[in-house]
């Protein structure tokens, strides 16, 4: 036997071994290198365990074929410089395409996974985005039906609408004397008198569990029936229409008495202290507000995915009583405006393109506009910067009752300047107001300047939406107050009025609007410096009774593939207030302008039921001179929005709401008209007793954004 | 893929012998060390030589140096050239592609 | 030639038990070793090739390890399967000097 046993048979002759670093040869490229237990980086904070384990795998796998091709690369190197390799290095060798191939594989592999596992989180966070708003909109549209039914509930006090109810509108009744008791009791339990034996919110606390239950349509026994039996009964009082159409239950001052009483514009003009006008491209630094308002829609409007019933608990297409009537021309003749972005009333259209233009620029809106309106209702002038979205059907039909008494219409609204804003459906689009007045158009000057305003604190501002006093003078305006001391949505003549927004413009009288938002334009990031400092300008003071933004929302036409843009985009990031600009005028209209109620009228339901109608005297309905929410809807009631977006949390707003001292721009406040008649009055619902002027619902705080 | 070792036999000392590595399902490459190694009866492995099929260089064990020799015949087989057998040389002899392929062997037997 | 020693020549162990191997080369030759596994009969199958990485198909149980001049193999959780002898072998080249790929003596494994 050979004695070089030690020494034998191998496979490879023997030289000198390559450095100790290196490792060797590698046989089968198969033969991974035992990997690390990294996982894969770059991927989403929340990732689903199999997407975990999976980049685990590939980013292992990933290093050890980097791992290996460094090796092959070493042997290949060494190879050119004439060193040999052995058998495996130079099989690893012979795989070197392979390596690599699986290299650009396993990187790509490990690029799709994460983006992967990035749209998964992205889809995760949308879920969970998309069900936190559906849960916000359920507490919404939860809340706007608690506001109809309180709603509801306060006019059953009312006599004539009662008689209404039981006698029906088409000789049909709607309630039998027997439901209107039942409705009675229940008010009872949900606004009960205040027992000061109670702490508040226990008092409520019991308010609250009647109105769930009865949201929930429980079988659970209240009042001598079922809570369930109330919602239906409920159910079919809203379903009847009967409170959105007009009934003429006026027993304010008509239109003789009033127009005796009307100063003249010139008057008027004497006395109003216009703000100094300012060059409209400054940036106001004043804070500005954010308002929002998705009351008037149509019950296509926002849904998200399925079409709402249309009777559960409100049809949703909204008449407006006051229909945009004629507006008499002599009733605020053109005088000259302090901010008029348009100086006459068709200046050049290059320059009126550039004026829009630089407006744009400063708003960074993301709106689509359009030069002329898509609807040229008698050739009025069309400001250029009207924002753009579906055009509205201009063959709707134009007609609307006449006013009884047309001259009140420019003032009769203003006792319900505080009602629209109730909206817990409104349309969020966050309005920046800010408080000064540049590039304004019809600038009322009749407004008086900030700097003379006083806000009477009456109490706190626990409203559902802001609702803004007045100078203190104003603030007991009666019905009688002239029609040219009211805030005019527009004035005659060359001067254009804002647009009313958040009416929807399916009913006839808004068709005539023309500026629509675009709402499938993105939302401009709230990071961005300008967002709350937009110069949004609006009239000062239009009636906020049917607007919280100056522009007129064009939402009926929205189809449901844009919902979820909408959706998305105004849920998406609460952080980002939706800019609109705010001085987009709408020219003079025959037909057009804010609907008020034809006259201005007592609701005859006093101030609470039972109560003495002198106690209610300037209040005209719901709330005490405090200015709480409880105002408006004499003639009518639209109906709250039913639709299941019901308005974009006022969560979105990043700052408390201030209305201290001054009049915010573009609201009224919803001060109670009327001196008239006053009486005692039975109590149908056994509300005997003192005046109670907190008649609504738990108030809620609005909120203010800087 | 495999090999396959013959011309084993049994010869007489001092004889010559020639055996032959065949390839089945490959040929032999550029890539290749074709290595011959032998294994007494209850003996451990005994390296004899390899060949590099690239270049043709070969290595043989020291004690193996001037009576064996390596080559390739064609493109799927190898030799292995023995001289001046002696009954030390007796052994299983198998042919190796590297050091991963191994032939069955095939046993030489060097007896008078 | 650079020659390789394998110890212990035998070891005996019980099934799940744990054996270890070492091989030391008369210098160092990096990481250019492999192991085998032999049973009777059959040629050599290469079990780890440059120290520590293991062949396809090859359980794990089975861990190479080691650089340079001293080497060893360690496998766990014996199986009577194990039983047989494993050697380990230079596999270094090189265009200048010749280290030869020697085979260690061997080392029988016996699973009780």
């Known amino acids: 036997p050979s004695a070089t046993s030690h020494s034998g048979s191998g496979s490879k002759s023997s030289g000198p071994p390559p450095p100790s670093g290196s490792s060797g040869s590698e046989a089968a490229a198969g033969a991974a290198a035992p990997a690390s237990q990294h996982p894969a980086t770059g991927t989403g904070a929340v990732q689903t365990e199999a997407m975990k384990q999976i980049l685990g795998v590939i980013d292992k796998k990933l290093r050890n074929l980097e791992k290996k091709k460094g090796k092959l690369d070493d042997y290949q190197e060494r190879m050119n410089k004439g060193e040999r390799l052995n058998q495996d290095q130079l099989d690893a060798v012979s795989k070197y395409q392979e390596v690599t191939n699986n290299l650009e594989f396993a990187k790509e592999l490990q690029r799709s996974f994460m983006a992967l596992s990035q749209d998964i989180q992205k889809t995760i966070k949308k879920t969970a985005r998309r069900e936190q708003l559906m849960r916000e909109e359920a507490e919404q549209k939860r809340l706007k039906t608690v506001l109809e039914l309180q709603y509801v509930l306060d006019k059953l006090g009312d006599d004539d609408v009662r008689t209404d109810l039981k006698q029906g509108l088409s000789g049909v009744p709607i309630l039998s004397e027997e439901e209107l008791s039942l409705l009675d009791e229940f008010y009872k339990l949900v606004d009960p008198e205040r027992d000061m034996s109670l702490r508040l919110n226990e008092q409520y606390e019991h308010a609250s569990i009647h109105l769930w239950d009865l949201l929930e349509g429980k079988e659970k026994p209240v009042c001598g029936t079922t809570y369930k039996a109330l919602k239906e009964i409920v159910e079919r009082v809203f379903q009847s229409n009967y409170f959105d159409s007009t009934h003429n239950h006026q027993n304010g001052l008509c239109e003789e008495e009033e127009a005796a009483s009307a100063p003249t514009v010139e008057d008027q003009v004497a006395e109003a202290e216009p703000e100094p006008a300012e060059e409209y491209t400054e940036q106001s630094e004043v804070e500005s507000t954010e308002y929002v308002n998705r009351q008037f829609m149509a019950e296509t409007q926002f849904s998200s995915g399925e079409k709402e019933q249309v009777d559960e608990w409100t049809v949703e297409t909204v008449e407006v009583v006051n229909s945009l009537q004629q507006q008499p021309q002599a009733a605020s003749p053109s005088v000259p405006e302090p901010h008029s972005l348009t100086p006459v009333a068709q200046s050049d259209p290059l320059v009126r393109r550039q004026r829009v233009q630089d407006l744009m620029a400063q708003m960074q809106g993301p709106y689509n506009f359009i030069q002329d309106s898509m609807l040229d209702f008698e050739n009025q002038t069309l400001d250029p910067a009207i924002v753009s979205a579906q055009p509205m059907n201009p063959t709707q039909n134009m007609d609307m009752p006449q006013l009884v008494c047309p001259q009140v219409h420019s003032e009769s609204r203003l006792a319900q300047s505080n009602q629209v804003p109730v909206q817990p459906e409104a349309t969020q689009v966050p309005l920046v107001s800010s408080t000064s007045e540049g590039y304004t158009a019809s600038q009322p000057l009749y407004q008086p300047s900030h700097a003379t305003e006083q806000r009477p604190q009456k109490e706190p501002m626990d409203q559902i939406q802001a609702t803004i006093s007045l100078n203190t003078d104003q603030t007991t305006a009666s019905s009688s107050l002239p029609a040219a001391s009211q805030p005019q949505v527009f004035q005659a003549g060359t001067s254009k009025p804002l647009h009313s927004s958040g009416i929807n413009v399916n009913a006839a009288p808004f068709q005539s609007m023309q500026t629509v938002f675009n709402m499938n334009a993105p939302v401009p990031p709230a990071n961005e410096p300008e967002t709350l400092k937009q110069q949004s300008q609006y009239q000062a003071t239009y009636n906020q009774s049917f607007s919280s933004q100056p522009h007129q929302v064009e939402q009926t036409e929205l189809q449901q593939d844009q919902l979820q843009t909408v959706v998305g985009t105004y849920h998406g990031s609460q952080d980002q207030p939706h800019q609109v600009p705010g001085n987009h005028q709408q020219p003079p209209q025959q037909n057009t302008g804010f609907p008020r109620s034809s006259q201005p009228y007592y609701n005859s339901r006093g101030v609470s039921r039972g109560g003495s109608r002198g106690a209610r005297g300037l209040m005209n309905g719901y709330r005490g001179p405090a200015n709480g929410f409880r105002g408006g809807y004499d003639g009518y009631r639209p109906s709250f929005s039913n639709t299941p977006n019901s308005g974009y949390s006022q969560s979105q707003f990043t700052a408390p709401r201030d209305y201290s001292g001054y009049q915010r721009d573009g609201y009224q406040q919803n001060f109670k008209r009327g001196s008239g008649q006053s009486g005692p009055r039975g109590a149908p619902r056994g509300r005997g007793g003192p005046p109670r002027p907190n008649r609504g619902m738990p108030q809620m705080n609005t909120q203010q954004v800087n | 893929q495999s090999l396959e070792e013959s011309g084993g036999d049994l010869v007489k000392p001092g004889a010559s012998l020639t055996l032959t590595c065949t390839a089945s399902?490959?040929?032999?490459?550029?890539?290749?060390?074709m290595s011959w190694v032998r294994q007494a009866p209850g003996k451990g492995l005994e390296w004899i030589a390899y060949?590099?099929?690239?270049?043709?260089?070969t290595a043989y064990a020291n004690w193996a140096k001037g009576r064996f020799t390596i080559s390739k015949a064609s493109s799927t087989t190898v030799t292995l050239q023995m001289t001046s057998l002696t009954a030390a040389d007796t052994a299983t002899y198998f042919c190796?592609?590297?050091?991963?392929?191994w032939g069955p062997g095939t046993l030489v037997t060097v007896s008078s | 030639d650079v020659v390789m020693t394998q110890t212990p020549a035998s070891v005996e162990a019980a099934v799940g038990g744990t054996v270890t191997i070492k091989c030391q080369a008369s210098?160092?030759?990096?990481?250019?070793l492999a192991w085998y596994q032999q049973k009777p009969g059959q040629p050599p199958k290469r079990l780890i090739y440059?120290?520590?990485n293991l062949d396809s198909g090859v359980p794990s149980r089975f861990k190479g390890s080691g650089s340079g001049t001293d080497f060893t193999i360690t496998i766990s959780d014996l199986e009577c399967a194990d039983a047989a002898t494993y050697y380990c072998?230079?596999?270094?080249?090189?265009?200048?000097?010749?280290?030869?790929?020697?085979f260690g003596g061997g080392t029988e494994v016996v699973v009780k």
């Open positions: 190796a592609r590297g050091n991963k392929l």
């Open positions: 399902g490959f040929s032999f490459s550029g890539s290749y060390y």
């Open positions: 060949i590099y099929i690239g270049d043709g260089v």
């Open positions: 210098q160092s030759i990096s990481s250019y």
């Open positions: 440059d120290a520590s």
């Open positions: 072998q230079c596999t270094a080249v090189s265009s200048a000097t010749i280290y030869g790929n020697a």
